[in-house]
């Protein structure tokens, strides 16, 4: 049964067995077509999600479509049915939370009161002022807390007590890739993870322990991509895994934060990564308790020097690492997470590639998951 | 070396058609994107279309959609360019252009030497 | 399209003179701007990238400045291979545009 299982695939209708590597190569080997049905799915960008949240202090704002303008969102008459209805248009399911926050003195944009139409936020037609003087802050989901927090350091073995959103994706039982926790259903990795092995029924989700091999497997149903664009191929590597059945949060598997759409760090900025990856490039192993380090935000223009990857470095990535080099993520690390720490900590990048491990010119290259929140919002919306 | 070639440029009459080809070697001509650049005499230079690395997507300037048509051979390294209803205001030295990145076409780094189309009657 | 323009269109210096072109976009590109130098007869050929990396084997003498909508490209001692035409391009979004052009000429 194991070796029928590893090696070959059921057709129904009639019942007969094909070679497993015949799964998700686009041909249809299976009268039904079942071959091709569980295998790796591209999901277009989709249009602009017309609601968002801002750094300051997660405040809601809502697009006008009529003129591409956004709006914040004021308080007056903003119910719980107005913050389910804008969580929902992010794809979230889960039970939101808001209060009201001051409107600061550096506020830019027009506040409006919202109300709701066809399931979507709209801007009040006779929107007078905004009379509480207060905005929306919004939170779809409780995330990005850990029990522990990390100590300021090089490299160092890591607790899934302080990063209880990191998971190990396996292919045949073997480590393939990082990924991290966004809600009870939803675990945040890169693409390239997928390039080998395109077929979903092998693929599975370890989460809650630090040890590679001591926590049990989660079958996966779905693995979303995002469309390939041609002109920019190194572009869009980020993915979505569905997962058959929900998490249930405990201290050691929580969700961690999607980054605000407007969360522009700084060079310096500091961030972690995790991930059970080489421990030395070519290294030949993996290691097999989590480790942890502390980075910070390389600047963009300065990674695309001649030096370093001569201009290779576009706008839907970030770089970090550490200026001297010798701390970075590795082969194994991929598609795991880039965490940046306000009040809570927040997913802004992915384990995308890089030139070798840990060179001072060369530091880890990033998805930057900002540049995609419309996308994993519009997927998770697909699926509610 | 990267080294671009173009050819097929010459003297044209008001409303016909050419093909510009340009040879590609010193690079994986395969994973670059690539563009079609040109400059009137004495002007200023004039972006006019690009291809992406597997020829699926293309983007042209206004001043030539619907008249040129860039395309390529990969087999060959070769990038093409096929001109119809040509104008006087085409005439210029026409050049074929290299991405630095393959992750994304918009910055160009090398240049072929030109072909020089003239327009005229 | 976004529209580049370039000052001055013309410049007449010396040999070791320090030598100053902008260039303004119609709306914000980033750090998206590239600088080229084009001799008579020539392809151009690329200096400066991402407004202020320098292009390998150009020499240092060039340097790049500026973010947002307003860019400067510096000779900061003249020599005389450099005289020649420069042009700006925005490398932002499609279509691809160029300045007009900044031809430096020997006084």
């Known amino acids: 049964k194991v070796i029928l299982d590893k090696y070959y695939f059921l057709c129904g209708q009639p019942l007969h067995f094909i070679p497993r590597k015949q799964l998700c190569d686009g041909e249809l080997d299976c009268p039904l077509g079942e071959d091709e049905e569980h295998c790796v799915k591209s999901f277009p960008e989709g249009p602009a999600v017309a609601v968002r949240l801002s750094k300051d202090r997660s405040t809601l704002q809502v697009l006008d479509s009529a003129t591409g303008n956004w709006f914040s969102a004021c308080f007056d008459n903003f119910t719980e049915a107005l913050a389910e209805t804008a969580c929902r248009q992010m794809g979230y399911s889960s039970k939101p939370t808001f209060r009201a926050v001051e409107i600061g003195p550096d506020q830019d944009l027009d506040v409006v009161e919202i109300t709701e139409n066809s399931q979507e936020l709209r801007m009040r037609n006779s929107s007078g002022p905004c009379l509480s003087g207060s905005l929306v802050s919004l939170h779809c989901l409780a995330c990005g807390k850990s029990l522990k927090t990390p100590r300021v350091v090089g490299v160092e073995e890591a607790s899934v007590d302080s990063w209880p959103w990191q998971v190990s994706i396996q292919y045949d039982k073997q480590h393939v890739c990082g990924g991290s926790i966004l809600d009870p259903h939803w675990v945040l990795t890169a693409a390239h993870c997928f390039r080998k092995h395109t077929d979903v029924f092998n693929w599975k989700v370890r989460a809650g322990s630090d040890k590679l091999g001591s926590f049990p497997s989660l079958a996966v149903a779905k693995i979303i991509i995002i469309e390939f664009n041609p002109m920019y191929p190194k572009d869009n590597d980020i993915a979505l895994m569905k997962l058959q059945f929900p998490l249930t949060f405990s201290g050691t598997v929580r969700p961690i934060c999607l980054p605000f759409f407007d969360e522009e760090l700084t060079p310096a900025t500091p961030l972690w990564i995790i991930g059970w990856g080489f421990t030395k490039q070519n290294g030949g192993k993996m290691s097999d308790i989590l480790l942890q380090a502390s980075v910070q935000v390389i600047d963009s223009t300065r990674c695309n020097a001649d030096d370093a990857y001569q201009g290779e470095v576009t706008e839907k990535m970030m770089c970090a690492g550490i200026p001297e080099g010798g701390v970075d993520t590795c082969q194994g690390d991929s598609g795991g997470p880039l965490m940046y720490q306000s009040d809570q900590w927040h997913v802004v990048g992915i384990v995308s590639w890089g030139y070798g491990c840990g060179g001072p010119s060369t530091p880890g290259v990033y998805t930057k998951v900002s540049a995609y929140l419309n996308w994993i919002y519009n997927v998770w919306k697909a699926e509610l | 070396e990267v080294q671009l070639l173009e050819s097929g440029g010459g003297l044209v009459q008001p409303g016909g058609s050419l093909r510009l080809s340009c040879a590609a070697s010193g690079f994986t001509f395969s994973s670059y994107a690539m563009h079609w650049v040109r400059q009137a005499p004495g002007k200023g230079l004039e972006w006019l279309a690009v291809?992406?690395?597997?020829?699926?997507?293309?983007h042209y300037a206004d001043s030539v959609k619907g008249r040129f048509t860039i395309s390529r051979d990969n087999s060959k390294n070769t990038l093409y360019l096929q001109m119809n209803s040509l104008r006087a205001e085409d005439t210029a030295v026409y050049y074929c252009?290299?991405?630095?990145?393959?992750?994304?076409?918009?910055?160009?780094?090398?240049w072929g030497q030109g072909t020089l189309v003239t327009v005229s009657s | 399209d976004i529209q580049m323009t370039q000052s001055p269109s013309s410049l007449s210096a010396s040999v070791g003179d320090r030598v100053t072109i902008t260039c303004r976009a119609s709306q914000g590109i980033s750090n998206s701007l590239a600088w080229y130098q084009q001799k008579p007869g020539k392809a151009p050929k690329l200096l400066i990238y991402s407004a202020v990396n320098l292009q390998s084997g150009v020499p240092s003498r060039f340097s790049g400045s500026g973010s947002g909508t307003d860019f400067t490209l510096t000779i900061s001692s003249l020599q005389p291979e450099d005289f020649a035409t420069y042009y700006c391009q925005q490398a932002n979004s499609f279509p691809l545009t160029f300045g007009g052009g900044t031809k430096v000429e020997i006084k």
């Open positions: 252009a290299k991405p630095k990145a393959s992750s994304g076409p918009r910055l160009i780094d090398y």
């Open positions: 291809i992406s690395f597997d020829g699926s997507i293309r």
